[in-house]
């Protein structure tokens, strides 16, 4: 059997660090057997069998010129083997961050904080942490570790499914190369890393007969669980075209009636989501949707989405108060947000 321990990586390759002493091992001989060493394709003897180093070649202060293929021969001239030297660095701790788009799963991504120049792989696992004692603030890893399954195709990402919203987790990402391993531990709680995807299906429609109104509607992001234990709240911004500043409102449901739109101008609208108990952070903004208030008169039918008194809207004069903002109350069945939220708008 070979006297050379096989480092992780391709066969026949041995590894060292620039600026350090490197030992190469002749794979096809018995440990301690004297051998001669040559660079592949060069006749010059690098180290003879009388060096006292047996089956090893020592390169002091290795640098990039030492990289390449070496040949070792036994005393009778037989080929002891070929060895390729590759120089690089031991792993540094990877940089790890975790994020959650819902309250049941989270993913962690990583990047090397320093490129080693060597074949590298990552080991990913996690533990669930629990509080020690009812009144204790101390936490200790208690269950696991379990593997954090990595994405196929080499993406630097792993996903924890079926996480508990109120638990804390310790993520372990270990960078491994032939010169060693280095581990980054990251403590995460789902509550702090929760960031929903932006709401979907944003639509902006005019309200016939109301030249200062726009109705915006949207849906929950598809990534939010279908049977929710936790709701989302929303933030809506709108502005007329060419106007730099956004107006912001927090709608009560999945619709909002804007009552102070600028007549005749297109308006940009966007919406963001957050856990309704303020866990984590607001989502990114949805793509903007555009709408222009109507210029016609009110139709004879009451709009299907709500009830409005049927007199046409009177635009307020400069010195008269604006009409009150419609009251938008969510449907009593608050937890089933997949139903359309019933909007009731009553003008005084």
């Amino acid at each position: 059997s070979s006297p050379c321990p096989q480092a992780w990586g391709p066969p026949g390759v041995q590894y060292g660090q620039p600026g350090r002493s490197v030992k190469l091992c002749c794979p096809g001989v018995t440990a301690g057997d004297p051998v001669s060493w040559f660079r592949d394709g060069e006749p010059k003897l690098l180290q003879g069998p009388d060096s006292g180093l047996g089956h090893e070649l020592v390169l002091a202060q290795a640098d990039s010129t030492d990289e390449g293929t070496y040949i070792c021969q036994t005393l009778d001239g037989a080929l002891g083997g070929t060895v390729t030297l590759q120089l690089g660095y031991p792993p540094a701790r990877p940089v790890v961050s975790c994020q959650a788009a819902d309250y049941e799963n989270f993913s962690c991504t990583w990047s090397p904080s320093q490129i080693s120049g060597l074949p590298t792989r990552y080991l990913t696992s996690y533990r669930k942490k629990t509080v020690l004692g009812a009144d204790s603030q101390r936490r200790s890893p208690s269950t696991g570790p379990w593997p954090c399954p990595q994405d196929p195709l080499g993406a630097a990402r792993c996903v924890v499914h079926g996480a508990e919203f109120w638990s804390q987790y310790r993520i372990n990402v270990t960078e491994v190369n032939p010169l060693g391993a280095s581990t980054r531990l990251l403590d995460v709680s789902l509550q702090s890393i929760l960031r929903p995807d932006p709401p979907q299906g944003l639509r902006v429609e005019s309200v016939p007969g109301y030249p200062r109104r726009l109705r915006a509607s949207w849906t929950y992001p598809a990534s939010w669980p279908c049977q929710p234990h936790f709701l989302l709240k929303f933030r809506l911004q709108y502005r007329p075209a060419q106007h730099p500043a956004w107006s912001t409102v927090e709608p009560a449901g999945l619709e909002e009636v804007i009552t102070d739109a600028v007549a005749g101008l297109p308006h940009a609208v966007r919406v963001s989501a957050r856990d309704f108990l303020d866990a984590g952070t607001w989502s990114t903004w949805s793509p903007e949707a555009w709408g222009t208030p109507s210029t016609g008169t009110i139709p004879k039918e009451i709009p299907a989405w709500g009830q409005l008194h049927t007199q046409p809207e009177v635009e307020p004069q400069v010195d008269s108060p604006a009409p009150p903002r419609p009251s938008l109350q969510p449907h009593p069945r608050l937890l089933d947000h997949r139903d359309s939220v019933e909007q009731v708008a009553v003008l005084a």
């Epitope: 540094a92 701790r93 961050s97 991504t109 990047s111 904080s113 490129i115």
Partner: antibody, heavy 118, light 107 residues
Framework: EVQLLESGGGLVQPGGSLRLSCAAS????????MTWVRQAPGKGLEWVSS????????QYADSVKGRFTISRDNSKNTLYLQMNSLRAEDTAVYYC???????????WGRGTLVTVSS | DIQMTQSPSSLSASVGDRVTITCQAS??????LNWYQQKPGKAPKLLIY???NLQTGVPSRFSGSGSGTDFTFTISSLQPEDIATYYC?????????FGPGTKVDIK
Amino acid sequence: EVQLLESGGGLVQPGGSLRLSCAASGFTFSWYSMTWVRQAPGKGLEWVSSIVPSGGHTQYADSVKGRFTISRDNSKNTLYLQMNSLRAEDTAVYYCAKPLDWGLFDLWGRGTLVTVSS
Amino acid sequence: DIQMTQSPSSLSASVGDRVTITCQASQDINNYLNWYQQKPGKAPKLLIYDASNLQTGVPSRFSGSGSGTDFTFTISSLQPEDIATYYCQQYDNLSPTFGPGTKVDIK
């Protein structure tokens, strides 16, 4: 010679913007994370931001989050810090540093002074 | 963020004296602690990394010890060129933090 050279500092009004650059030489820039550290006049050192070799992960101090953006161009061996909405408390010498393992700063530039004042 | 405290904030000592600076972290940082020297108008210079390892080219009179939350930096025999401010710095997490510094001068 292994070195880092910052540029782009100067006097700017509150609310203004500035872009700092750090030119690296003498080492394989694209292999290393890079960092900005600042030091207000007469004060201690404060880590500002770091970026991994690929640029895919960035990290910011809370005091600059949302206002500063770190980036890099590995083809030009250059690190950048885009500073927006500058405040008086951002006045400092800004150092570019090369860390090993993200936070072990073995190489520093000479620094560039940023003064935020009206 | 992890808070770092240093003591004393300043000290005066004679040439040849043994000088000791302590650094405390607000939570366990393993041995992810570095020490830097900064002379007036100059950039910081790494002296000790990972609590106790001497950076290449740094004189052996500088040393460090400790792990967890409590760390010590020592100059075994103070030299005139050691007049500077010394900072400890943790990098256990992704937001490195520095201690407030200890200013060392000669009596």
